[in-house]
Interface confidence: medium
């Protein structure tokens, strides 16, 4: 249904001025004016404010060419001043003016709240010419009005660089309250006060607010919008909403859940990603955060060994990523691992414990009593050593790695040999004569290569000069290795 503009104001004394399609009779009562050149605003009274001078919409044309007759002043006819309608209804209103035929190219534009309405608006201007004047009716229609259509609409007409402005037509779109601020979901500390805000607007105003907690109204009497609800504290989760009421009805906000912060749930699915001799890489799935962000996590590690003292190693780490590399562990050891995380309220319980093992470690000591001597007849170097005293965690010995470096004038060459675990001697071919050979030996297990022994040097003379004295590593506690030639 189209809401047609209808005058609701009290009647005013009007000059007759018939106009096709006019919504209201003309109102052009003017003070008596002298002949003027050009246009001047004329003093007139607005029907919306009786008795108050009104100067905004009248232009006085100069005399005709004959100079005998004063043309009537130009003014928009008065129409309805205020249209009230519901959202989604259609509305049509107009302004009209009678313009002497001496004026050409008159155009009417529509303005809303001081801005010209251009483009996709339904504005139609109709012309009704007569002998002396042309009646112009400018209609403006809005289909399915919205709140954004509220405002003051005026017509403007330009004639000879003068502007004639109509009285405003106020459009008021009424509807159910419209929320400009709704309560937001929150996570709050138990028994701690917090505020919720609700704001809604009309028209029609005023808008009043009822608060609802878990389907029960909180305030017996409504509060004028905006309303701030102070909740003294909660012990359990609650759902709040607000109802905005005006004359037209009520609108209910979204329901928001207010959660009580709690300690997190324990992490789950602790997994082993990688184990080495001295480290284990773990990951976990965080538990529920208790409505408060995780701050950090704690990885707890217990050695599973009847002989261990049962102490727990604790490694603190950030809450994200949900992964941690536990270091400084013993090789070939069994561990029980659990994870706990904390938020602002406190620590979660520990996750289910999982078992994990480190792999064999590399030997921690080098072979002992390394001796090196030259066997010139065979043109090789004899190397002997003693098996190191490795710990159980190093795992089973699988062999030895021998490093021999040959150095002579400006040349240095390192070679590596691998020998089996049952050996305690090896022979290497002489690579260079008139050079120094430096030998180091390391024990090897599945866990890796242990430390190399201290270097033992032997000089390899040119052919024909032989020294059978061996070179060796010193006994423990002795000074640096001695080179014997």
């Amino acid at each position: 249904a189209i809401t047609e503009a209808r005058e609701e104001a009290k009647p005013y004394p009007l000059f007759p001025g018939p106009l096709p399609g006019s919504l209201q009779t003309d109102h052009t009562s003017l003070l008596s004016l002298p002949h003027t050149s050009g246009y001047q605003p004329a003093l007139m009274f607005s029907p919306t404010q009786p008795g108050r001078p009104y100067t905004g919409n009248v232009a006085i044309p100069r005399v005709t060419s004959a100079g005998s007759k004063l043309l009537p002043p130009l003014a928009f006819k008065h129409t309805v001043g205020h249209i009230i309608l519901s959202e989604h209804k259609d509305v049509k209103f107009n302004c009209s003016i009678s313009v002497p035929n001496i004026y050409q190219d008159t155009t009417i534009s529509w303005w809303k709240d001081g801005k010209e309405l251009l483009g996709a608006h339904h504005a139609i201007t109709q012309f009704y010419p007569d002998d002396e004047v042309t009646a112009i009716i400018a209609s403006f229609s809005i289909t399915s009005v919205q709140r954004s259509d509220n405002g003051s609409y005026i017509c403007k007409m330009k004639i000879n660089n003068e502007e004639i402005v109509s009285d405003p037509i106020y459009i008021e779109v009424q509807g159910l309250p419209h929320f400009t601020k709704q309560p937001e979901s929150m996570n709050v500390t138990r028994n701690t006060a917090f505020n919720l805000t609700c704001q809604a607007v009309g028209p029609p105003e005023p808008v009043n607010i009822f608060w609802v907690q878990n389907s029960s109204r909180v305030n017996e009497q409504p509060e004028k919008s905006p309303s701030v609800l102070t909740v003294p504290g909660l012990t359990e989760m609650a759902v709040f909403s607000c109802e905005a009421h005006n004359d037209k009805g009520l609108t209910v906000s979204k329901g928001v859940q207010i959660n009580i912060k709690a300690i997190p749930s324990p992490p789950t699915e602790v997994s082993i990603h990688n184990s080495t001799a001295h480290s284990i890489l773990i990951s976990w799935v965080p538990g529920f955060d208790g409505y408060s962000p995780f701050r950090n996590c704690s990885v707890q590690v217990k050695e599973v060994d009847p002989l261990s003292n049962g102490s727990v190693m604790i490694f603190n780490t950030s809450a994200s990523p949900h992964m941690y590399q536990i270091k400084q562990l013993q090789a070939l050891a069994n561990y029980s691992i659990g994870v706990s995380c904390m938020n602002e309220i406190g620590w979660s319980a520990v996750s289910p414990w999982i078992l994990a093992s480190t792999t064999e470690g590399a030997p921690s000591v080098a072979p002992l009593n390394v001796t090196v001597f030259l066997n010139e007849s065979r043109d090789n170097v004899d190397i002997r050593w003693m098996k190191p005293l490795t710990k159980r965690q190093a795992g089973e010995l699988v062999g030895y790695r021998i490093s021999h470096v040959w150095q002579s004038a400006g040349i240095s060459k390192e070679l590596l040999e691998e020998v089996g675990q049952n050996n305690s001697r090896a022979q290497i071919s002489v690579q260079v004569h008139n050079a120094t050979c430096t030998v180091r030996i390391a024990a090897v297990t599945k866990g890796g290569v242990g430390p190399f022994s201290d270097p033992v040097k032997i000089f390899i003379p040119a052919h024909g000069w032989v020294d059978h004295a061996p070179s060796s590593t010193p006994a423990p506690g002795n000074a640096d290795p001695v080179l014997i030639i």
Partner: antibody, heavy 124, light 107 residues
Framework: QVQLQQSGPELVKPGASVKISCKAS????????MNWVKQRPGKGLEWIGR????????NYKGKLKGQATLTADKSSSTAYMQLSSLTFEDSAVYFC?????????????????WGQGTVVTVSA | QIVLTQSPAIMSASPGEEVTMTCSAS?????MHWYQQKSGTSPKRWIY???KLASGVSGRFSGSGSGTSYSLTISSMEAEDAATYYC??????????FGAGTKLELK
């Protein structure tokens, strides 16, 4: 004080129309929904619809839309209900009713004020 | 639309007796009101918003309920309480619906 004064009894023939009125006083007529309620003899209450005189907005009970037309005249603070294509089933007392305040919807407070009722009799 | 079922349809009570009548909704309602109507008169708002007594209503009356189940109770029946009582609901949108009524008679 708030008063809702309804028009007198009506005797109408089947198929005809009737327009009954409810004149309001003691409050700002344009700012409160006016509801209409039907009560057949010995039966319960049935909501027909409502009108907001401020802008002419209306709501109707689905099955009565089209048969009942609600209007309001702000200048005389009078609400009207026109019933068309009347049948014997439309013989009833018709009440106008409204809530109590301007500031919240009558769904919160119910119908505080009622007219005295208009008897409509449909008879051949 | 929401259907309201009142029970019992008719009941009688002796003076001083406690009376309870119920109103069951086909789905959850936001607002429930009760009206009293005596023969040949307009209905009167009796209880609104579930439990608030209308002006002039005796404290012997009380209302309670939530969701789909509501009741009106008279703690001590008096002769003037004999009438028909209607429950009325209004949720988020029209239509408003009334129950069929409970007729309370004096024994």
């Amino acid at each position: 004080q708030v008063q809702l004064q309804q028009s007198g009894p009506e005797l109408v023939k089947p198929g005809a129309s009737v327009k009954i009125s409810c004149k309001a006083s003691g409050y700002e007529f344009s700012r409160s929904w006016m509801n209409w309620v039907k009560q057949r003899p010995g039966k319960g209450l049935e909501w027909i619809g409502r009108i907001y005189p401020g802008d002419g907005d209306t709501n109707y009970k689905g099955k009565l839309k089209g048969q009942a037309t609600l209007t309001a005249d702000k200048s005389s603070s009078t609400a009207y209900m026109q019933l068309s294509s009347l049948t014997f089933e439309d013989s009833a007392v018709y009440f106008c009713a409204r809530g109590g305040g301007y500031y919240y919807d009558s769904r919160y407070e119910g119908f505080v004020y009622w007219g005295q009722g208009t008897v409509v009799t449909v008879s051949a | 639309q929401i259907v309201l079922t009142q029970s019992p349809a008719i009941m009688s009570a002796s003076p001083g007796e406690e009376v309870t009548m119920t109103c069951s909704a086909s789905s959850s309602v936001s607002y429930m009101h009760w009206y009293q109507q005596k023969s040949g008169t307009s209905p009167k708002r009796w209880i609104y918003d579930t439990s608030k007594l209308a002006s002039g209503v005796s404290g012997r009356f009380s209302g309670s309920g939530s969701g789909t189940s509501y009741s009106l109770t008279i703690s001590s029946m008096e002769a003037e309480d004999a009438a028909t009582y209607y429950c009325q609901q209004w949720s988020s949108n029209p239509p408003i619906t009334f129950g069929a009524g409970t007729k309370l008679e004096l024994k």
